[in-house]
Interface confidence: medium
């Protein structure tokens, strides 16, 4: 007989986490991001849904919009016009893809305390925003852009080409939304509200992905999405700028594409307004190792936008793709000519550079074997950015200030010593010119949000400290979390290990590897979390490990670009290496090791299970990619090149999960996918299943009808985690 596998946390009145705690979100935390409306004023939606105005300097606060007004139209979001005369209220939120949604909008007049009647907005609207000055409105309806000079005015139609699934104006198509812009919008007001820049995406020649949505009807309906998979025809993109003062006099003016970009397939990657008559566009070749930043000026006399060649700045990678996950965006100085930008230095670490005339003459502002991650704000005398420099932990984020007014510039870490144990992973939210800012700490301790003076960095007040959460966790046995590194040959891998309460090194524990592993991702972060794996460690006594292998971010290009053109090799190899090292530590039961992952992690977990090493007893893949030919062009090609004979077709074919079907014979495999996954299509799992059946390999599977890539509806999510828990406990011989 085998000894009982039930894990019992000993001698403690505290209780273990339950799966129910996780599914109910009992231990979720809060953050506080001010909605800045000036240098010293912000809005915030209170717990009871009042919209409250705060002035930091006068310390006054009052409700500018009551919850009863919000409730009268079932509003879930709001937006104040810059002249503070109107508020839009958003209701009937209907999710589309990752960022996009449609909604109904109502305009509330704060002066007279009633909704604006006459020329009401059509519904549903795809995107709506105020101009940066006054109360002009731009919105997208049925793929066309409209303009209102005032909320009560009739709308002016700016574009007429919009057509469902064919031409998108001011909003991205599927692939641009998910893989390039990471927004629901593709329009940008100039700082003074005179011009409106927008992108037109023409998807007319893009192949369609079609899948069934079962719903409740007698017949399923078919969802059709123009979705370019690797090597397929891509959207044709054009950028236009319209003068919103006289939109009827002069139509939208097209902004020219740099010649070196236009000579072959290309992408638009971002637009940044520099000043009221200067705009910066970023473009990318389809083979994504060349990016061009183009600064364009409005020529009043010609009524055109011109982008002189000497205002084109080229960024090129010789070892991989340009940028990190996305190409970084510029942070312009007050002179509207020079800018700060993060890109790889000569040693392959991403750092801040100052560009005054040419990229070749760029001045490196930060340096070291760590990476600058994001530039938050550039003011007259300061530059605020985040990095993972402090104490050499790649999975931390601290906020730094460089005093660019000083010569030489001096650097100060704003956050490193504030709450050293509790807070090692920060982001920030700055008022317009950084007179004040909020710091949001995500962990490793309980998240906390604080308000600070932008000149002295002094803490002014705590905005949210999660006291209730702290109290409710007092009687919970939380696992211990360690972040360490392991070495193998010349490589260093950071890992996070979640150890059961009362962990005893002399005992043997089952091990679950949680993997994502996608290019430019990071799993080993110093953040607070109470989730499914926390429960598995707390209640079921499972050791959890997350490992950042080659291809992951913020440790230099040598580590990042190792996976270039050969996805599915080193990501898997490094997980296997880590497992062997964990076994050597002595407290892992070699007979009970599992791996699981979602999306890219499902791909890596599948390949790891099929590695033929015998390391894993079982594993789970949720919504896995199974072949890079099935995934989006922008993503697949960024890291793999094209699936053509003269490029990288061979590795596209070699790196599929299907090619390793035979190797699943000796593991327990649970394959899970939502049938309405617009992102990683159900096709991926269907092909894995087909290959396993053809190879006569037994496996378990679960589909979630009408669920997308997140499998996030309450009932589905509960079912999913319950199902995975049963599978794991069975695999590890843990009794229910």
């Amino acid at each position: 007989l085998r000894p009982s596998r039930v894990y019992k946390p000993e001698g403690n009145t505290k209780r273990a986490l339950t799966l129910k705690d996780i599914l109910n979100g009992t231990f979720s935390y809060k953050t506080y991001f001010p909605n800045w409306i000036s240098e010293q004023e912000y809005l915030h939606q209170s717990e009871d849904d009042n919209i409250v105005f705060y002035n930091i300097e006068t310390r006054e606060s009052y409700i500018i919009l009551s919850n009863s007004t919000m409730k009268s139209v079932n509003a879930t979001d709001y937006g104040l016009s810059p002249d503070r005369q109107f508020v839009y209220l958003e209701s009937d939120y209907s999710k589309l893809w990752r960022y996009s949604y449609t909604a109904t909008y109502y305009i509330y007049d704060l002066q007279n305390g009633e909704f604006v009647r006459g020329y009401e907005l059509p519904r549903p609207i795809q995107y709506l925003c105020w101009s940066p000055v006054g109360s002009k409105l731009a919105y997208v309806y049925q793929n066309n852009i409209y303009l209102k000079q005032r909320p009560g005015d009739p709308p002016f139609q700016i574009t007429y080409t919009g057509r469902e699934n064919r031409i998108f104006n001011g909003i991205p198509d599927w692939v641009y939304e998910e893989e390039m812009l990471a927004t629901k919008y593709a329009l940008w007001w100039s700082p003074d509200g005179k011009f409106l820049a927008y992108v037109e995406f023409n998807d007319s020649d893009i192949p369609i992905i079609a899948y069934s949505y079962y719903g409740d009807g007698q017949y399923p309906r078919t969802i059709n999405i123009p979705y370019p998979k690797a090597g397929a025809k891509n959207p044709v993109v054009r950028v236009f700028i319209v003068d919103t003062t006289y939109p009827h006099h002069v139509g939208p003016m097209e902004v020219p594409v740099p010649e070196m970009i236009a000579s072959s397939d290309y992408y638009f990657s971002w637009l940044t307004w520099v000043s009221s008559e200067r705009v910066c566009l970023q473009w990318l070749k389809r083979v994504q190792n060349v990016s061009v930043l183009s600064i364009c000026d409005f020529r009043e006399d010609w009524h055109a936008w011109e982008c002189p060649k000497n205002q084109e700045h080229v960024e090129e990678s010789r070892t991989g793709w340009a940028g990190g996950f996305f190409v970084s965006t510029p942070a312009f100085s007050q002179d509207a000519t020079s800018y700060y930008k993060i890109f790889s230095d000569k040693d392959g670490y991403k750092h801040i550079h100052y560009i005054k005339d040419t990229v070749e003459n760029a001045i490196q502002i930060t340096s070291g074997k760590w990476e600058a991650i994001y530039i938050f704000r550039v003011t007259q005398d300061s530059l605020f950015y985040s990095s993972n420099e402090f104490e050499g932990y790649p999975g931390r984020r601290n906020i730094y200030r460089i005093s660019i007014g000083n010569s030489p510039p001096s650097k100060k870490c704003v956050t490193c010593h504030l709450r050293k144990e509790r807070c090692q992973y920060y982001t920030a939210s700055f008022s317009y010119k950084a007179k004040y800012y909020a710091l949001v700490c995500y962990g490793p301790g309980l998240p906390i949000s604080t308000l600070h003076d932008g000149r002295t960095d002094q803490e002014i007040q705590v905005l949210e400290e999660n006291k209730e959460l702290e109290n409710s966790l007092r009687n919970i046995q939380l696992p211990k979390v360690e972040i360490k590194k392991l070495k193998d040959g010349g490589l260093t891998f950071w890992y996070k290990m979640i150890l059961p309460p009362q962990f005893d090194r002399s005992k043997k524990y089952p091990l679950l590897i949680q993997v994502y592993g996608g290019p430019c991702s990071q799993s080993v972060k110093s953040v607070f979390a109470v989730n499914w794996i926390t429960y598995l460690a707390s209640k079921e006594g499972i050791v959890i490990a997350l490992v950042d292998g080659r291809g992951t971010a913020f440790q230099g290009d040598k580590f990042l670009h190792a996976v270039y053109r050969k996805l599915g090799v080193y990501e898997v190899e490094d997980q296997l290496t880590a497992v062997r090292k964990f076994i050597e530590m002595g407290f892992i039961d070699e007979e009970r090791i599992a791996i699981w992952g979602w999306s890219y992690g499902g791909y890596v977990s599948s390949l790891a299970l099929a590695s033929g090493t015998g390391l894993f007893k079982c594993g789970i893949a949720v919504a896995p990619v199974s072949s890079w030919e099935y995934y989006a062009s922008i993503y697949s090609e960024r890291f793999m090149g094209l699936p053509t004979k003269d490029d990288n077709l061979e590795h596209y074919k070699n790196s599929t999960v299907m090619a390793r079907a035979e190797y699943f014979r000796n593991v327990d495999y649970l394959l899970i996918h939502g049938t309405a996954d617009d992102n990683v299509h159900f096709q991926n799992s269907a092909q894995i299943a087909k290959a396993l059946v053809n190879a006569q390999v037994d496996f378990q599977a679960m589909w979630y009808s009408d669920q997308n890539h997140g499998i996030s509806s309450g009932r589905s999510q509960n079912h999913l985690y319950t199902h995975m828990t049963h599978f794991l406990k069975q695999c590890f011989s843990l009794s229910d």
Epitope: P256, E259, W302, E306, P308, K309, Q311
Partner: antibody, heavy 117, light 108 residues
Framework: EVQLLESGGGLVQPGGSLRLSCAAS????????MSWVRQAPGKGLEWVSA????????YYADSVKGRFTISRDNSKNTLYLQMNSLRAEDTAVYYC??????????WGQGTLVTVSS | EIVLTQSPGTLSLSPGERATLSCRAS???????LAWYQQKPGQAPRLLII???TRATGIPDRFSGSGSGTDFTLTISRLEPEDFAVYYC?????????FGQGTKVEIK
């Protein structure tokens, strides 16, 4: 490779008309503004006219305003210059050039227009 | 209109020597809109310098541009036989775009 090829030049009497053409290849013609620049024998360069990429905006030097008309056919990748009421001082080599503001980055080989009785 | 005045009218130099050509504008011109061209007899002009100092594609590094405001300079560090030609500066800041009258660089 960008190529611009002018045609239509020749000898014409004062007061006469002529239509110049410029066939473009090697770039996305409709995305770029185009210009005509001329050079009188033994003299310097003089900008004549320009047209936006879409053809929606046109511009002329004072010396030709009202007499010359610039146009383009983006479906044929061709630029035109219709010259009416020609004068002796219009005698020049006419170049078609890509670009119209900061610089002219590509030029055709030119076509000679001679106005003489 | 902006008048561009080039000096000298003619520059007589030997191969290997340094050539310095000047272009003065009647009013301030943004660097972004100042270009230089080279023209050889019987040929179309060729773009040399854009944005006052950036070499156009394929232009050898012996050609360099500098200056701002109203004074701009084209320098040829070591004259090669193929460099003997007429050089024009041009502004595109205001309508109409205008050219200088040209500087002829001839063999001494």
């Amino acid at each position: 490779e960008v190529q611009l090829l002018e045609s239509g030049g020749g000898l014409v009497q004062p007061g006469g008309s002529l239509r110049l053409s410029c066939a473009a290849s090697g770039f996305t013609f409709s995305s770029y503004a185009m210009s005509w620049v001329r050079q009188a024998p033994g003299k310097g360069l003089e900008w004549v006219s320009a047209i936006s990429g879409s053809g929606g905006s046109t511009y002329y030097a004072d010396s030709v305003k009202g007499r010359f008309t610039i146009s383009r056919d983006n479906s044929k990748n061709t630029l035109y210059l219709q010259m009416n009421s020609l004068r002796a001082e219009d005698t020049a080599v006419y170049y078609c050039a890509k670009g119209w503001l900061g610089n002219f980055d590509y030029w055709g080989q030119g076509t000679l227009v001679t106005v003489s009785s | 209109e902006i008048v561009l005045t080039q000096s000298p009218g003619t520059l007589s130099l030997s191969p290997g020597e340094r050539a310095t050509l000047s272009c003065r504008a009647s009013q301030s011109v943004s660097r972004s809109y100042l270009a230089w061209y080279q023209q050889k007899p019987g040929q179309a002009p060729r773009l040399l310098i854009i944005g006052a100092s950036t070499r156009a594609t394929g232009i050898p590094d012996r050609f360099s541009g500098s200056g701002s405001g109203t004074d701009f300079t084209l320098t040829i560090s070591r004259l090669e036989p193929e460099d003997f030609a007429v050089y024009y500066c041009q502004q595109g800041q205001v309508i109409p775009p205008t050219f200088g009258q040209g500087t002829k660089v001839e063999i001494k």
